[in-house]
Amino acid sequence: GHWGAWMPSSISAFEGTCVSIPCRFDFPDELRPAVVHGVWYFNSPYPKNYPPVVFKSRTQVVHESFQGRSRLLGDLGLRNCTLLLSNVSPELGGKYYFRGDLGGYNQYTFSEHSVLDIVNTPNIVVPPEVVAGTEVEVSCMVPDNCPELRPELSWLGHEGLGEPAVLGRLREDEGTWVQVSLLHFVPTREANGHRLGCQASFPNTTLQFEGYASMDVKYPPVIVEMNSSVEAIEGSHVSLLCGADSNPPPLLTWMRDGTVLREAVAESLLLELEEVTPAEDGVYACLAENAYGQDNRTVGLSVMYAPWKPTVNGTMVAVEGETVSILCSTQSNPDPILTIFKEKQILSTVIYESELQLELPAVSPEDDGEYWCVAENQYGQRATAFNLSVEFAPVLLLESHCAAARDTVQCLCVVKSNPEPSVAFELPSRNVTVNESEREFVYSERSGLVLTSILTLRGQAQAPPRVICTARNLYGAKSLELPFQGAHRLMWAKIGP
């Protein structure tokens, strides 16, 4: 043999009970002591430090803390140094060293020692991870190292968590003993934070010890708080709240169209939108995620705003007889009432639509002119004016005529035409044509689609000449002999050389 000792490195006992520290030791066989003596020291192995003597086989002298509380259960002659401590109190917690005394110079303090822990609560062992929906085993373990007092275990607050199974007394690796009771159950998310207790009682004594463990049940997120659809006026402040219940707290993410707007590990997350614009109208998603799962919900944000200025697309220049299609469109929320007016007359209207199509089949010159597209909802009104130009061949209007006054003759040629025509006055009798470019004789004035050209003739009195007015544009030409109103002497201007 050789010098060596075997005892548990740590051992526990309930306050007020006892503890048996199992201990064996060995020494070289050749020492052959007649009597083996031994000493148990408390907290220090160095005799020089005068550590409290827990037990000494040679004498009854022990430290006052251990008076009447220490006894050797083992037989030192059989190399068994098992120590019994009774009525243990917290101050007895610490290190216990054994010193073998074989006589002569052979006293040996073993470096192996036992650390006594005085406890007053059962140890509830919950697995490091408890997941909702997955069966779990919770154990209650208490030291059972006192041969005089055996603990009995019972569970507290386990109603609905299954029936406990008592495993009984189990030997641990280093020779210490524990009493174990098991509880098997499938936890729900509601069990999170539940206080589960275990009670150790000692029959025929008043000793009773309770320990509690709070269940830390892990479970996936469920979104429990979220706005219903939100309507907001453009420029206002909008708060979108998402709250989730999970353990551990989730990573909450606000997203829109795949873009992360805000995220945080929290139980609730507020998305603040300052001065909302129509561009922020849409579907917002809240995603809650932890290691155990995820949940997501969406909320629609509707940004209410007055119509934008309508845009008008289509043919703005048309030839008489063609069909004209004009599209007036806008954007607003809610959709507007769209109306197309011409000279205060409603031509077309739609309710709660964002575009209005105006069809004008076989346009005539009367369709030429200014039109208005008006968009309106409860938040405002916007209008856009547009002009439709109808092109047609000249039409000589009936008010065209010639009239004599003193020494002049004035001829009016009134033409309706689009585009503007060129006008010429022909005096067949003189074989003369006067164009509007000859400002000395011809004055032209246009009002809308009507062009009035006035030819002024000065000269001697003669018979009134025939005057033919010809109006021409790209769509055609029209001629009219201008009638005279009254037969007067005329003054003729000499035209030409």
Partner: antibody, heavy 126, light 112 residues
């Protein structure tokens, strides 16, 4: 040089007590253990036990427990043997003898007694 | 305890002659951890304390004449004085210091 000088002879009546001293010099007192050996008149040597001068811990041979006490005064490098309730059979020469000690960690190894005191005769007689 | 038995109890040897004293232990005094024999020999002259001659069964203490030698291992040991001198007259004790310390009963050496 190493010297162990013991106190002088003592004549005591039965039931009395006696305290024998052993003053060491010439070496470091606490590096050596101090043994006590008894030699009755015309008899052999009997080891009574020893005291660890470093820790102050005494060890008594099985026949010398109870009435025999080893003590120290390290300040004056002196070891003491006290015998109480003296009996006639305690009459003997009492020797102190040192032994080297090799310390390692919390333990030590003791070796042979190399230097002895001159002895103190204790006579117990009525 | 380990019992030490010396032989003979007394011995008379002529000056200059070899003297041999034997010592037998009831159990081995050889320590396995260091392979040393925990045995010593002492010389005690009348009115004097014992004097260490030999330790570890065969190691001579400083200052001891080389005519003294020790031998043996385990349980059987011998002290030899190769050439007896007049000043060697004394009682010789063997002593084990492995376990609880014990001495032999002593051997009285005289001049023949």
């Amino acid at each position: 040089q190493v010297q162990l000088v013991q106190s002088g002879s003592e004549l005591k009546k039965p039931g009395a007590s006696v305290k024998v001293s052993c003053k060491a010099s010439g070496y470091t007192f606490t590096n050596y253990g101090m043994n006590w050996v008894r030699q009755a008149p015309g008899q052999g040597l009997e080891w009574m036990g020893w005291i660890n001068t470093y820790t102050g811990e005494p060890t008594y041979a099985d026949d010398f427990t109870g009435r025999f006490v080893f003590s120290l005064d390290t300040s004056v490098s002196t070891a003491y043997l006290q015998i109480s309730s003296l009996k006639a059979e305690d009459t003997a020469v009492y020797y102190c003898a040192r032994n080297p000690i090799n310390y390692y960690g919390i333990n030590y190894e003791g070796y042979v007694m190399d230097y002895w005191g001159q002895g103190t005769l204790v006579t117990v007689s009525s | 305890d380990i019992v030490m038995t010396q032989s003979p109890d007394s011995l008379a040897v002529s000056l200059g002659e070899r003297a041999t004293i034997n010592c037998k232990s009831s159990h081995s005094v050889l320590y396995s951890s260091n392979q040393k024999n925990y045995l010593a020999w002492y010389q005690q002259k009348p009115g004097q304390p014992p004097k260490l001659l030999i330790y570890w069964a065969s190691t001579r203490e400083s200052g001891v004449p080389d005519r003294f030698s020790g031998s043996g291992s385990g349980t059987d040991f011998t002290l030899t004085i190769s050439s007896l001198q007049a000043e060697d007259v004394a009682v010789y004790y063997c002593h084990q210091y492995l376990s609880s310390l014990t001495f032999g009963q002593g051997t009285k050496l005289e001049i023949k």
